[in-house]
């Protein structure tokens, strides 16, 4: 687990859970409702969602030097998306099907974030900017956009954990 002082997370566990997240994110994406792509804005909502960027220390060298920076960034993103998936955007109307993978996705995001941050230690989490509340007519597009950006986020996280499991595990 990633704890203050530079301890390593359970890389293999994180790798397995992040791979599961990738699968769930892709399976949830087409199930959030009919999406007319013409409704999308020209801009992406890049300011609204967390991204793993070059300066976040998630490259192989950065992970070797100090994995905490990258892990904190991943943790922030996981919490961000976990909150979104628990918000009225996903829980409100139009209702998701009872067997929708979104519920599993939500639980897995929480599970991986807890692997990265044990109780008693609190990393600063990113605020959710004006993404809630919403009305039903807005939600299909919001779900679509959020899941699409989540796919990209968990894909990068999975690569980080795969690298960590292969090269940084004790």
């Amino acid at each position: 687990r990633a704890v203050p002082g530079g301890s390593s997370p359970a890389w293999t566990q994180c790798q397995q859970l992040s791979q599961k997240l990738c699968t769930l994110a892709w399976s949830a994406h087409p199930l959030v409702g009919h999406m007319d792509l013409r409704e999308e804005g020209d801009e992406e909502t890049t300011n609204d969602v967390p991204h793993i960027q070059c300066g976040d220390g998630c490259d192989p060298q950065g992970l070797r030097d100090n994995s905490q920076f990258c892990l904190q960034r991943i943790h922030q993103g996981l919490i961000f998306y976990e909150k979104l998936l628990g918000s009225d955007i996903f829980t409100g109307e139009p209702s998701l099907l009872p067997d929708s993978p979104v519920g599993q996705l939500h639980a897995s995001l929480l599970g991986l974030s807890q692997l990265l941050q044990p109780e008693g230690h609190h990393w600063e989490t990113q605020q959710i900017p004006s993404l809630s509340p919403s009305q039903p007519w807005q939600r299909l597009l919001l779900r679509f956009k959020i899941l699409r950006s989540l796919q990209a986020f968990v894909a990068v996280a999975a690569r980080v954990f795969a690298h960590g499991a292969a090269t940084l595990s004790p």
Partner: antibody
């Protein structure tokens, strides 16, 4: 006092362009979705377009898709509607609106501007 | 698209009358419906939101009911200032759609 003030309407020839503006005051503009609604003379209300607080998500009525573009400048507290390839059937009073009802907010805003008239005619 | 059908298109009534306007959605919209009042040359004014919630500052003689596809706006005792056009509007899915309007006229 929450206020919306539209401008930019006028007479334009078919195929022409206009840009409407809506200046907002009295509330935190960047927190809220905004929209445009229009009303042809003697007719009912028609929703035109909406935009998410960040500006990154937009919605349009089929009748204006590909011709109209909604945008906002949160630093200027201003909402815009760029209207291209205008047709006679776009002739209407255009209202800018802030409508938060039903969205789980405690503050139920439903504020409309006074409207700006757009006439498309040769 | 969800069609909103309002009836009647116009109604003649006297001060003190009870007036009922109905709105039917072409598919279920839960309670995502609002009622607006509009007077000539003015912007619409919200009366009722979420099918039955009275907007702040709106007199209690206005009330809304219904869920799913059938909705009603009732004015319990018509006042002189209530002569106007009334619109219903759904916000369940895009495009957001309004009813055709009901004109309440003086008998």
């Amino acid at each position: 006092e929450v206020q919306l003030l539209e401008s930019g309407g006028g007479l334009v020839q078919p195929g022409g362009s206009l840009r409407l503006s809506c200046a907002a005051s009295g509330f935190t503009f960047s927190k809220y979705s905004m929209e445009w609604v229009r009303q042809a003379p003697g007719k009912g209300l028609e929703w035109v377009s909406s935009i998410w607080p960040s500006g990154g998500l937009t919605w349009y009525a089929d009748s204006v898709k590909g011709r109209f573009t909604i945008s906002r400048d949160n630093s200027k507290n201003t909402l815009y509607l760029q209207m291209n390839s205008l047709r006679a059937e776009d002739t209407a009073m255009y209202y800018c609106a802030l409508r938060t009802w039903g969205s789980g907010n405690n503050d139920v805003f439903d504020i409309w501007g006074q409207g700006t008239m757009v006439t498309v005619s040769s | 698209d969800i069609q909103m059908t309002q009836s009647p298109s116009s109604v003649s009534a006297s001060v003190g009358d009870r007036v009922t306007i109905t709105c039917r959605a072409s598919q279920g919209i839960s309670s995502w419906l609002a009622w607006y009042q509009q007077k000539p040359g003015k912007a619409p004014k919200l009366l009722i939101y979420a099918a039955s919630s009275l907007q702040s500052g709106v007199p209690s003689r206005f009330s809304g009911s219904g869920s799913g596809t059938d909705f009603t706006l009732t004015i319990s005792s018509l006042q002189p200032e209530d002569f106007a056009t009334y619109y219903c509007q759904q916000s369940y899915s895009t495009p957001l759609t309004f009813g055709g309007g009901t004109r309440v006229e003086i008998k």
